[in-house]
Amino acid sequence: KLLQVSTIAMQQQEKLIQQERALLNFTEWKRSCALQMKYCQAFMQNSLSSAHNSSPCPNNWIQNRESCYYVSEIWSIWHTSQENCLKEGSTLLQIESKEEMDFITGSLRKIKGSYDYWVGLSQDGHSGRWLWQDGSSPSPGLLPAERSQSANQVCGYVKSNSLLSSNCSTWKYFICEKYALRSSV
């Protein structure tokens, strides 16, 4: 009889443990849902305010045609600049035409004056070819004017009206680029 009672007690305890687990899972699930809800609300608010402002570019970015540009306020080496742009969902500036180059240099003159700005151009160590970050070649008129004598990796930067080259480990400002959002109006 005692054995029977003890077995029932153990079964009850096991049931209780299972219910506690289920409750814990439910609480965790509820917390997760609430958090997801908060994220969704924040995301929706961001989206709605962006839609309301109907700005094709984020705050502090400059628009030209289909592109948005961000001119950094900090210095960094080329690789860190690349990382900083990626964080923003952008890449280092890729200059496609003389018109784009003129817009960039004109804007920089207005904003900051004659400083150095990393762009998404680097020189392949083996072949010596200049390539943009997506692997495409720059058009002939958009090759860095001087060949850097550095034994280290060489990257491209904009200064005044020129595209120049330098050791990628030197510190400069940088320019990020992303696509402008199309207006649905």
Epitope: Y39, E88, G89, Y179
Partner: nanobody, 121 residues
Amino acid sequence: QVQLQESGGGLVQPGGSLRLSCAASGSIFSINAMGWYRQAPGKQRELVAAITNQGRLTYADSVKGRFTISRDNAKNTVFLQMDSLKPEDTAVYYCNAKWYDPLVIEYYDNWGQGTQVTVSS
């Protein structure tokens, strides 16, 4: 939070190909960019390739013309197609997601557990 699950590593001969996959789950709507980094023994982790939420691409000089990054938005998955593999591509490859938390206005990096790629004859 963003969780990342990698697959596709392995042993391959020089000149061979491999395809890495990375599936993202969690706060995927907050992801600004996803990419692949690698770390060879005794070396620093380096960016191999990345793709932004707008589809803009970035490659390391050493892989340009050999590796291709792409994504499947429906499956929240990023792929790295590695062709013409060289012994110097041997490393642990990590998937990375750069995401923005609108609640705390903060940027984060999340990493996968890594997948070994060995190029050897």
